[in-house]
């Protein structure tokens, strides 16, 4: 069983390497941004924009949203290609979990305050769902403060 | 050297059938999506089919949905495409080629291309 | 379906010269999916540049790209030899993945 276990973490690990988590990071901060734009924030405002070139550049996603983004533009391709990114981890719940843990890691630095990761976390959960795929069961999605790309 | 190797063209009759297969080397295979690309006689460029590393995902063009089925061995590194009730309108080059994306920021692409096997569809 | 429509059919420059093709989509297309080919007679396809600005391996750096959402251009600055070919754009985002018709950049 070990053996086993401990080829599945490694087919996993190969399997997360060969992943294109970016189009989910993409969907997810889109969708988080659009949620607080309805909700009476200024869409143009670059004081809030996680992405804002005001911010550290090296931070700055080239591919992320703009405001004119906002509006949905590109957002059902961030969701098709990463639907099919997490589609290749459908018969491996554990992986499927280290996959999601790793878009919030990777984006953990970009969320700005409590109520934008609690938001991130919350969408994220419900990623698989959207996808039409099993959601794993049991997946922590905390991450240390001061959390790092794993690309 | 990364290569890709296309097959299985030939002459055939409308509503006939051919398989073509791409074999490749010179990478690990089933790291990649996978995609047929084809050209009618002096035209563009049209996409036919993609197929993801584990075969999860396939998607056709509208042109070849229910005649065409696009699969992949990973064990012998290769891809194929069974081309059924084939049309006038089917004759062309048919490339396969690999896609990857860019690790840091996420773009896919076909970076890899084979020279194509040609499929000329005439009574 | 995204339809992606290439303009001018044909662009006749000469070398020195710059060139600029227009790539416009039937609806917004994220730059992360827009991708740029060169393809000579007899011969496959050449990535060219992926989401929408970045140059692949080995491109050099007269080739250049721009936009979002709905229009997209390359720019070549100054036109050698063997630049003179068809560039095609694609979208790669959402299924079916579509070409642009082409742009054939011929030498005048």
């Known amino acids: 069983r070990q053996q086993w276990e401990l080829q599945g973490d490694r087919r996993c690990q190969s399997q997360l390497e060969r992943a294109n988590l970016r189009p989910c990071e993409q969907h997810l901060m889109q969708k988080i941004q659009r949620d607080e734009d309805s909700y009476g924030r200024d869409p143009y405002s670059p004081s809030q924009d996680p992405y804002s070139p005001s911010q550290d550049p090296d931070r700055r996603d080239p591919y992320s949203p703009s405001p004119y983004d906002r509006r949905g533009a590109g957002s059902s391709q961030h969701q098709e290609r990463c639907c099919n990114e997490l589609n290749e981890f459908e018969n491996n719940q554990r992986c499927m979990c280290e996959a999601l843990q790793q878009i919030m890691e990777n984006q953990s630095d970009r969320l700005q305050g409590r109520q934008q990761e609690q938001q991130f976390k919350r969408e994220l959960r419900n990623l698989p769902q959207q996808c039409g795929l099993r959601a794993p069961q049991r997946c922590d999605l905390e991450v240390e403060s001061g959390g790092r790309d794993r690309y | 050297e990364v290569q890709l190797v296309e097959s299985g063209g030939g002459l055939v009759k409308p509503g006939g059938s051919l398989r073509l297969s791409c074999a490749a080397s010179?990478?690990?295979?089933?790291?990649?999506?996978m995609n047929w690309v084809r050209q009618a006689p002096g035209k563009g460029l049209e996409w036919v089919s993609s197929?993801?590393?584990?075969?999860?995902?396939?998607y056709y063009a509208d042109s070849v949905k229910g005649r065409f089925t696009i699969s992949r061995d990973n064990a012998k590194n290769s891809l194929h495409l069974q081309m059924n009730s084939l049309r006038d309108a089917d004759t062309a080059v048919y490339y396969c080629?690999?896609?990857?994306?860019?690790?840091?920021?996420?773009?896919?692409?076909?970076?890899?291309w084979g020279n194509g096997t040609t499929v000329i569809v005439s009574s | 379906e995204i339809v992606l429509t290439q303009s001018p059919g044909t662009l006749s420059l000469s070398p020195g010269e710059r060139a600029t093709l227009s790539c416009r989509a039937s609806?917004?297309?994220?730059?992360?999916?827009l991708v740029w080919y060169q393809q000579k007679p007899g011969q496959a396809p050449r990535l060219l540049m992926y989401?929408?600005?970045t140059r692949a391996t080995d491109i050099p750096d007269r080739f250049s790209g721009s936009g979002s959402g709905t229009d997209f251009t390359l720019t070549i600055s100054r036109l050698e030899p063997e630049d003179f070919a068809v560039y095609y754009c694609?979208?790669?985002?959402?299924?079916?993945?579509?070409f642009g018709q082409g742009t054939k950049l011929e030498i005048k």
């Open positions: 609806q917004s297309v994220s730059n992360m999916f």
């Open positions: 080629a690999r896609e990857d994306f860019d690790v840091s920021t996420g773009p896919y692409y076909m970076d890899v």
């Open positions: 989401g929408a600005s």
């Open positions: 010179g990478f690990i295979f089933s790291d990649y999506n």
């Open positions: 694609q979208q790669n985002g959402n299924s079916p993945y579509t």
């Open positions: 197929i993801t590393r584990s075969s999860r995902t396939i």
